[in-house]
Every structure is written in structure tokens, then in C-alpha cells.
């Protein structure tokens, strides 16, 4: 049974007499008058067991200790440590010829853990073992005590274990404490990757070449190795682990990052706070959670904030111009946190009667300098149709516009486009002849722009060739041309008045009048 | 066992000597020295001095010198303690007592019985 | 010389209870003091020696201190057959003993 002393965590103790509870029991030769195992009380009045030898009498001693077996648990080179104290020759009276102030430490290799005699030959001399100038003081009792420590090394081992001895040769001399330790490089994680115990090599230069494991949560960057000197020191790390996303080093441990941090990639780079409108609720997390109403576009790097689409462009002027609207707005009062805000505008014609009714204006409506993705706060909307109520809607938006399931990002006007002069009556029709008169229908023009405030009609006798015409006007779609010539050739134009001026007259329509009482009734444009 | 065996008690008229011997057993006996401590009647001990047994050597305490010799004979294991020209005031028990070096101090860790000498005319 | 003086002269004692002697050298003897046990018609018996270790044999209720000029010999529990004389003795410069001191029974 040993008790616990604290040694270098790069030493692992393989015997340590100050921690054998009760006798060492250790075989001495001769059995008698050489070697005595001795209790003293250390500082703490607690018992060391001790071996001492004092025979400085008589000439040519040899006195033999041999430890019991010590295992060799796989080192190759293991060092003993020995605390002894020596009395010098000149303390002790009568002894001059016959004192030494030196012993022996030997030692011999064996696979039997049971050997009962000190074969002398068998055993191997490691070094005579002299008392330094320099001693340490320790008390003993109450009694300063002159300490010695002395260490040496053997190897290589190769047998399951080993067996020291002591060979006094006449000094006067006490084994305090004799411990047998290997070295290792211990247990280290060094760049995130763990190096196991390793027992240092069988040479006292030699270097042993051990390759690290990445420790939890961690993956390799270049291959971790090391070398464990012969001292028990790590040496030269090469190559290194980066904790995996979601994790970083802390106290040479790749620990999750906590709430409220993330990391993206495998990295030596910590944890990074959630950027702005941005959580995370779990440990571990490899990116953030965008808040409610905030979004993450594709190409949008996990450290960048979560933004929103924008809101609504702000001050919407448009400026009419008979067919064409110019329309101007300012940039809207939140971006939503991005630089990549642009504009598309929605064209609605829509009936003047309901204003809801509203249809897509169609590709004939021409946008400058474009309809979508619009990068300045204006457009010139042209080739509109007069006199018509049209919704226009500048929407606002950006990289996340399209995640918002509830938009609320655009502004409207509604216009009405001037009225413009109308478009040519396309069908006139002689509705009733006779002798002396003409009765005309026809259409409202196509395109009327505006309100038509009266048809006017021009007529002349196809002789004349236009050079002596009436004019007649009505508001209404349909009048009787009277006092005309029977049997007469006649060419009839028809045009529509807006506010805005005449249109274009129709296609002649030529009629003739009859010679006998009765009517004719047509509705081709020329009628005979 | 280890012991030490000294003579019975012995009565000398002054001016006389005697020689107490001090028999050792049960252990090397060159390898320890030997001691010599007297005890009058009624007083405290009084070392004598001692006598390597290796080289025969001795070392006489003060007051103990001249009439008092210390003497060996190895090939028996005993050592002698000589006092001649004897006065009353030797009047003691001489004790011989093995002395035991160590590397913690020394000590007289076996003794003889003692050998009382009296010196009455 | 080195004159030890041992205090006191006579210590009475019960049995069971604690017996502390003292030895006081004339001039430091470093560690180099012995404590000796003497009952009557017997010789001196070894207890201590270099001022602390107890000699082989000798029951663990005795222990000693000190070192240079004071010592101390402590009989934690004093048993019938403690009651004797002890004697220190130096083996710094040659060797002398104390006086004694005789503990008796209370």
C-alpha cells in the first residue's frame, strides 16, 4: 500500500520507499550486521523507513541491500533517485583506516519478481554514489539532518523488470528515500489536438516522433505531431486541428458557442455575437437565426446583419404630359439595412367609371430608362393612352424583398392622361338618300381622348374636288345633310372634336342622290 | 542474542589491582567498540572511555588515565578493564557497554551486568 | 569539558500522566545527545539516541527533542515500569553524562 506523494507529472513513479506503509522488508546480505532497516520521524512525527549501515570499524565491508522486484510498466530508460545521508569519517572517533564516505548502487534485469538471494555477480554497477559538497538541510525530529540527493539513469531495458541494490563498503551511511521513476511526456493537447502519455525513448537524445488526435468537436488543419524528448518535454509541435463550426477554443477545448454566438466555419477564429436582428437558442450554432420580419439573402454571408425589404418610396410626384407621365419619389425612410434598394414600376390602366377595375397596361406603355430594377428615383412613362386613368405603383425593393410574404413596400398614384385630339371616324354610313338629302351614321372614333364635343362633317360634289365644301356640325352621331343636288355624285368626310382640337376625317364616303322621289337606304361607306 | 557478560563482584585491598573481563556474544565483535562506565554506590554514571575493537585502540576520559588500561582479546570476543593500584574511592560497579555507531548518533545499546569492585583494606 | 545538568533532581509522577525531563549541555552538542534508562540493581538501558531516534525496542510513549545546548525526554504516558533514573549523555566532544533524574511514583 502507498501513500500519495506529489512527483513532475512527467515522472511515473515506479518505487518510492517514502511511500510504503509498515517495513520495506527488503533483502539484505549479510543478514545480520550490514543493513538494518531503521524507523525515524520526519517533521510531521510521521515515519520514514529507512535502511542504514554504520560498520566503520572493521576493514573490507561488504554490505548488500537489494530492493524487491520492480516492475518495468514498458520504460526503456528508467532513473533512480536516492536521499541518503553520510556521516563524515572525521565525526566519528577511532575510525580513520576503516571509514568510507561512498557506496555502490547496482542493478540487475529479471523476468522472476521472486528472486530470495543477492547474487552479487548478477548484478550490474550503475555508479559509485558520493555526498555532495552542497546538501540539502533537512529536519529530521528536531535535528537538522544532512540530505543528499543523487540521481541515475539506466537503460535500455528490455526484461519485465528490474532489481536494485546498495553495496556498502564501510561508510556510515542512511537510505532516506530511494525512488525509481521512468519520464513520459504527458497527456498534453497542444493546437486543439491531444498528445497521449508517451514514455520518452531508450536513449537519452532520442526523440519519439507521436501524431496527435483532434480533440472533440475539432478537425484537422495540417497533421498534429510532436516529439517527446528524452526529459519528458513536448517538442517542436507541427501541424494543428481548427475547432468545427459552431465551436471555438476555449481552454484548449473546442466548446460550442454559447447563445447568442455562432460560427460559421472550421476556423481558429472565436465565436462572433449574432449579427444585428439576428439570434441563436441553441449552443453549437453554425449560423443565426434571422428575427421575425428580417431575412438573409442568398448571397449574403452568415456574418452580415438580417435586413428586411424597405419600406415604401416616399414623396411621389408625377407630372403629365398629355401621353407620358414623368413620375419622381425619394428613396424610402428604411432601407431595411441593405445597399442593394431598386425600383420597379407596375403600370394599371383602369375604367373611368369603376377605378377598380384596373388590367395591366400592356407592352405597349414604354418606360425610360426602364420598368424594373431601377436604380435611380425617376422614370418617363410614354406612348400612353389619352384621356385614360392610369394607377402607377413604384415599388421599392431589395435582396430579401422576395422572402416578405406581406409587402408593404410600394407607393401609388393615380393619373388621368390629357385629352388629346381623337383618333379618324372609322365607318361612316349613308343611312337613308333621297333626292335631295343624305342621312349619315357612323362611330365614336377608336380612341376618342377625351370628350367628344361635336362631329363635323364636310361634304362636296365629287366634281368639285374639294375646292367648294360645306361644313355642317352636330353632337350627335348621326345628321341629315339636306338641299343637295338629285342625281348628284357627293363625297362626305366625318371628324371628332375633343377639347384638345379636331381629329383626323374619315375615309370618303361617297354618295348619290336620286332622281325619282323614292329613298334609298344604305350602309355602305359609298352608297349609289 | 547479542549480550555482554561481565564477572562477579570482586573485593581488593588497596594499592591492589584488578582486571574485570567483558565477554561478547552473539554478534561480531570487532565490529563494535567497547565502552567502560563506572557507577560509585548511590552516584550517577561516569564514562571511562572506549576501546576500538578493530585496531585495539583506546580513548581514556579524563580522570581515567594511568591507572586504568583497556585491553582486548579478539580470538574470545572479550575486552578487559585493568585498574591497578586500587583506592576506595574506586570503590564501583564497572559496566562494559557496546558502542553502536550510526549514521542518526551514537549510543551504548548493550551492556553487562556490571562487575561491582570493592576496595576496603 | 561539557557539563550537562538534568532538571529536576526528582520528578513525581502518576501513572498515566505525562513526564517531561529536561537535559541542558554547557556548550552546544549539536544532535549528539543520548537519553539512557537505569532502574535499581540493573544497568543503564538505551531509549534515545541522537537526540530524536528511538532506539531498537523502545516503546513509541517515550520520544526526545532538542538539539544544541536543550533537550527534552517525554514519557507521554507513564507505565509502573517507567519509574527508574534517566540519564542523558553527550558524544559531541568526548562523552559525559547528567546527574539524573529519578521519577518516582506520586
Known amino acids: 500500500v502507498t501513500g500519495s506523494r506529489v512527483y513532475p507529472a512527467n515522472e511515473v513513479t515506479l518505487l518510492d520507499s517514502r511511500s510504503v506503509q509498515g517495513e520495506l522488508g527488503w533483502i539484505a546480505s549479510p543478514l545480520e550486521g550490514g543493513w538494518e532497516e531503521v524507523s525515524i520521524m520526519d517533521e510531521k512525527n510521521t515515519p520514514i523507513r529507512t535502511y542504514q549501515v554504520c560498520n566503520v570499524m572493521e576493514p573490507s565491508q561488504n554490505n548488500w541491500l537489494r530492493t524487491d522486484w520492480i516492475t518495468r510498466e514498458g520504460a526503456q530508460r528508467v532513473y533512480i533517485e536516492i536521499k541518503f545521508t553520510l556521516r563524515d569519517c572525521n565525526s566519528l572517533p577511532g575510525v580513520m583506516g576503516t571509514c568510507k564516505e561512498t557506496f555502490n548502487l547496482y542493478y540487475y534485469e529479471s523476468d522472476n519478481d521472486k528472486e530470495r538471494f543477492i547474487r552479487e555477480n548478477q548484478f550490474v554497477k550503475i555508479d559509485t554514489i558520493a555526498a555532495d559538497e552542497s546538501f540539502t538541510q533537512v529536519d529530521i525530529g528536531d535535528r537538522i539532518m544532512k540530505l543528499n540527493t543523487e540521481i541515475r539513469d539506466v537503460g535500455p531495458l528490455s526484461k519485465k523488470g528490474f532489481y536494485l541494490a546498495f553495496q556498502d563498503v564501510g561508510a556510515c551511511i542512511a537510505l532516506v528515500s530511494v525512488r525509481v521513476f521512468y519520464k513520459k511526456c504527458p497527456l498534453t493537447v497542444r493546437n486543439l489536438a491531444q498528445f497521449p502519455d508517451t514514455i520518452t525513448g531508450a536513449d537519452t537524445s532520442s526523440l519519439v516522433e507521436v501524431r496527435g488526435s483532434c480533440v472533440n468537436n475539432s478537425e484537422e488543419k495540417d497533421v498534429p505531431k510532436m516529439y517527446c524528448g528524452a526529459d519528458g518535454e513536448w517538442l517542436v509541435p507541427i501541424g494543428n486541428c481548427l475547432c468545427n463550426a459552431g465551436h471555438e477554443e476555449r481552454s484548449g477545448e473546442c466548446q460550442a458557442c454559447k447563445i447568442g454566438y455562432y460560427k460559421a466555419l472550421s476556423t481558429d477564429a472565436t465565436c462572433a455575437k449574432c449579427p444585428p436582428h439576428s439570434y441563436s437558442v441553441w449552443e453549437g450554432a453554425t449560423s443565426c437565426t434571422c428575427d421575425r420580419g428580417f431575412f438573409r439573402a442568398d448571397n449574403d454571408a452568415a456574418s452580415m446583419p438580417c435586413t428586411r425589404p424597405p419600406s415604401a418610396p416616399l414623396n411621389l410626384i408625377s407630372n403629365v404630359n398629355e401621353t407620358s407621365v414623368n413620375l419622381e419619389w425619394s428613396s424610402p425612410q428604411n432601407t431595411g439595412g441593405r445597399q442593394d434598394i431598386s425600383y420597379n414600376v407596375v403600370c394599371k390602366k383602369c375604367g373611368a367609371g369603376d377605378p377598380s377595375k384596373c388590367r395591366p397596361c400592356g407592352s405597349g406603355v414604354h418606360y425610360t430608362p426602364q420598368q424594373n430594377g431601377l436604380k435611380t428615383t425617376k422614370v418617363s412613362i410614354t406612348d400612353l393612352l389619352a384621356h385614360t386613368n392610369y394607377t402607377f405603383e413604384i415599388w421599392a425593393v431589395n435582396g430579401v424583398s422576395k422572402y416578405n410574404p406581406n409587402p408593404d413596400q410600394s407607393v401609388s398614384v393615380t393619373v388621368t392622361t390629357n385629352q388629346a385630339a381623337p383618333s379618324s371616324i372609322a365607318l361612316v354610313q349613308a343611312k337613308e338618300v333621297t333626292r335631295y338629302s343624305v342621312a349619315l351614321a357612323w362611330l365614336e372614333p377608336d380612341r376618342p381622348n377625351g370628350v367628344i364635343l361635336e362631329y363635323e362633317v364636310k361634304y362636296y360634289e365629287k366634281d368639285q374636288n374639294e375646292r367648294s365644301y360645306r361644313i355642317v356640325r352636330t353632337a350627335a352621331r348621326n345628321t341629315d345633310i339636306k338641299g343637295l343636288n338629285p342625281l348628284t355624285s357627293y363625297v362626305f368626310h366625318v371628324r371628332a372634336r375633343t377639347a384638345a382640337g379636331y381629329g383626323d376625317f374619315s375615309e370618303p364616303l361617297e354618295v348619290t342622290t336620286n332622281t325619282v322621289p323614292s329613298r334609298i337606304i344604305g350602309d355602305g361607306a359609298n352608297s349609289t | 542474542q547479542v549480550q555482554l557478560l561481565q564477572s562477579g563482584a570482586e573485593v581488593k585491598k588497596p594499592g591492589a589491582s584488578v582486571k574485570v573481563p567483558c565477554k561478547a556474544s552473539g554478534y561480531t565483535f570487532t565490529s563494535y567498540a567497547m565502552s567502560w562506565v563506572r557507577q560509585a554506590p548511590g552516584q550517577g554514571l561516569e564514562w571511562m572511555g572506549w576501546i576500538n575493537t578493530n585496531t585495539g585502540n583506546p580513548t581514556y576520559a579524563q580522570g581515567f588515565t594511568g591507572r586504568f588500561v583497556f585491553s582486548l582479546d579478539t580470538s574470545v570476543s572479550t575486552a578487559y578493564l585493568q585498574i591497578s593500584s586500587l583506592k576506595a574511592e574506586d570503590t564501583a560497579v564497572y559496566y562494559c557497554?557496546?558502542?553502536?555507531?550510526?549514521?542518526?548518533?551514537?549510543?551504548?545499546?548493550?551492556w553487562g551486568q556490571g562487575t561491582l569492585v570493592t576496595v576496603s583494606s | 569539558e561539557i557539563v550537562l545538568t538534568q532538571s529536576p533532581a526528582t520528578l513525581s509522577v502518576s501513572p498515566g500522566e505525562r513526564a517531561t525531563l529536561s537535559c541542558r549541555a554547557s556548550q552546544s552538542v549539536s544532535s549528539n545527545l543520548a537519553w539512557y534508562q537505569q532502574k535499581p540493581g540493573q544497568a543503564p538501558r538505551l531509549l534515545i539516541y541522537g537526540a530524536s531516534t528511538r532506539a531498537t525496542g523502545i516503546p513509541d510513549r517515550f520520544s526526545a527533542s532538542g538539539s544544541g545546548t536543550d533537550f527534552t525526554l517525554t514519557i507521554s504516558r507513564v507505565e509502573p515500569e517507567d519509574f527508574a533514573v534517566y540519564y542523558c549523555?553527550?558524544?559531541?566532544?568526548?562523552?559525559?553524562f547528567g546527574q539524573g533524574t529519578k521519577v518516582e511514583i506520586k
Open positions: 557497554a557496546r558502542v553502536r555507531f550510526t549514521v542518526y548518533g551514537d549510543g551504548m545499546d548493550v
Open positions: 549523555q553527550q558524544y559531541g566532544s568526548s562523552w559525559t
